[in-house]
């Protein structure tokens, strides 16, 4: 079996995790993609996903998680804003391809969030909370359901999230150089 590798990110509370997961453009550009957490000894839990089919450069915000799929570059950008200590854990980007198991995009991300104000240029406590309006708990399904599920009886509310900030812009020149580089604004 292939050994799963991890990339470690150590951040402070309030900062933003910003990772880019690359995928095979021709195969998966419009496939639904998801961000999952794997707690120690637990099964992967999908926290957020793109639409199906996945839309190009269209931000999807679910709580403090923002997904953007850049079809032209074969990149899924994942941001977790206003990080909390409880967010620490192992994460992965996957491509949904039902009924097969989701296709994992290497590497997994080991996120370690610690308390305290870092006071360094890497710290972005203030900007994070000003830029992103974190919506309250919503009442929609986490992801578009891909079989014939029991439907939710409450319509999802219109999201008030605003993610069309300058931070949403991404200029890609040499894609290989920026895969999984933490971004601290």
């Amino acid at each position: 079996a292939t050994k799963l590798t991890e990339e470690k990110y150590e951040l402070k509370e309030g900062q933003t995790l910003d990772v880019k997961c690359d995928y095979t453009l021709e195969k998966f550009a419009s496939s639904q993609k998801a961000w999952q957490i794997i707690r120690d000894g637990e099964m992967p839990k999908t926290l957020a996903c793109t639409e199906r089919p996945s839309k190009n450069s269209h931000p999807v915000q679910v709580g403090r998680i923002i997904l953007e799929d850049y079809h032209d570059h074969g990149l899924l950008r994942v941001r977790m804003v206003n990080l909390q200590v409880e967010d620490s854990g192992l994460y992965q980007c996957v491509i949904y391809q039902p009924p097969k198991e989701p296709h994992m995009l290497f590497d997994r991300i080991r996120l370690v969030v610690t308390k305290g104000f870092s006071g360094t240029p890497g710290s972005n406590e203030n900007s994070t909370q000003n830029v992103y309006k974190i919506p309250p708990t919503t009442t929609k399904a986490l992801c578009p359901l891909y079989t014939s599920p029991r439907t939710v009886t409450q319509a999802p509310p219109k999201s008030t999230a605003d993610v069309s900030t300058p931070d949403s812009e991404i200029n890609l020149t040499n894609v290989t150089d920026i895969i999984r580089v933490p971004v601290f604004n």
Partner: antibody, heavy 119, light 111 residues
Framework: QVQLVQSGAEVKKPGASVKVSCKAS????????MHWVRQAPGQGLEWMGV????????SYAQKFQGRVTMTRDTSTSTVYMELSSLRSEDTAVYYC????????????WGQGTLVTVSS | DIVMTQSPLSLPVTPGEPASISCRSS???????????LDWYLQKPGQSPQLLIY???NRASGVPDRFSGSGSGTDFTLKISRVEAEDVGVYYC????????FGGGTKVEIK
């Protein structure tokens, strides 16, 4: 429609093992996790573990680690839960329940299988 | 493990009247995606449990709208706006924020 049909009641002696089956129908078997939950007579519900029928990976509650094994047969859309080294406290109704990785609750449950452990 | 505490243990109800069950967790059930990983189940006498509410406030398919779930973080409530005779049974809350654990149950019976 979605159905989870479990095997029949079992009577076992202490120290023995029991294997309960749960046959799924009415949906894509490999697209949903299958959980196992047990309930001792007159008691509450207790989560035992979960299997991903797609790849066969499992996660067990710490209490049952080393004693429980969950497997699946995709050709028959069946999952199995085997509990070994049985003791009288394991007398319970065992349920399989369907869940999803994006999480929307355990939306369908089997009818339950009573396992009685008695000498 | 996260400990789930339900109250009351027993709830005598009058048909047509409202009822409320409380569930408290030892840790926050709110995830980074804004969802509370808390479900409510009803186990009617002699039956398997059935899902009522998932992710804190989402009613499962086929569940009457007299059932509603609310709360966030560590404190949650299941409300029945007008109890009907068929609502009797044991109600359980369950968290799936971490390894799933159930509350001890609340037995709802007609007065």
């Amino acid at each position: 429609q979605v159905q989870l049909v479990q095997s029949g009641a079992e009577v076992k002696k202490p120290g023995a093992s029991v294997k309960v089956s749960c046959k799924a129908s009415g949906y894509t078997f490999t697209s949903y996790y299958m959980h196992w939950v047990r309930q001792a007579p007159g008691q509450g519900l207790e989560w035992m573990g979960v299997i991903n029928p797609s790849g066969g990976s499992t996660s067990y509650a710490q209490k049952f680690q080393g004693r429980v094994t969950m497997t699946r047969d995709t050709s028959t859309s069946t999952v199995y839960m085997e509990l070994s080294s049985l003791r009288s406290e394991d007398t319970a109704v065992y349920y399989c329940a369907r869940g999803a990785d994006y999480y929307a609750g355990f939306d369908y449950w089997g009818q339950g299988t009573l396992v009685t452990v008695s000498s | 493990d996260i400990v789930m505490t339900q109250s009351p243990l027993s709830l005598p109800v009058t048909p047509g009247e409202p009822a409320s069950i409380s569930c408290r967790s030892s840790q926050s059930l709110l995830h980074s995606n804004g969802y509370n990983y808390l479900d409510w189940y009803l186990q009617k006498p002699g039956q398997s449990p059935q899902l009522l509410i998932y992710l804190g406030s989402n009613r499962a398919s086929g569940v009457p709208d007299r059932f509603s779930g609310s709360g966030s973080g560590t404190d949650f409530t299941l409300k029945i706006s007008r109890v009907e005779a068929e609502d009797v049974g044991v109600y359980y809350c369950m968290q799936t924020r971490h390894t799933p654990t159930f509350g001890g149950g609340t037995k709802v019976e007609i007065k």
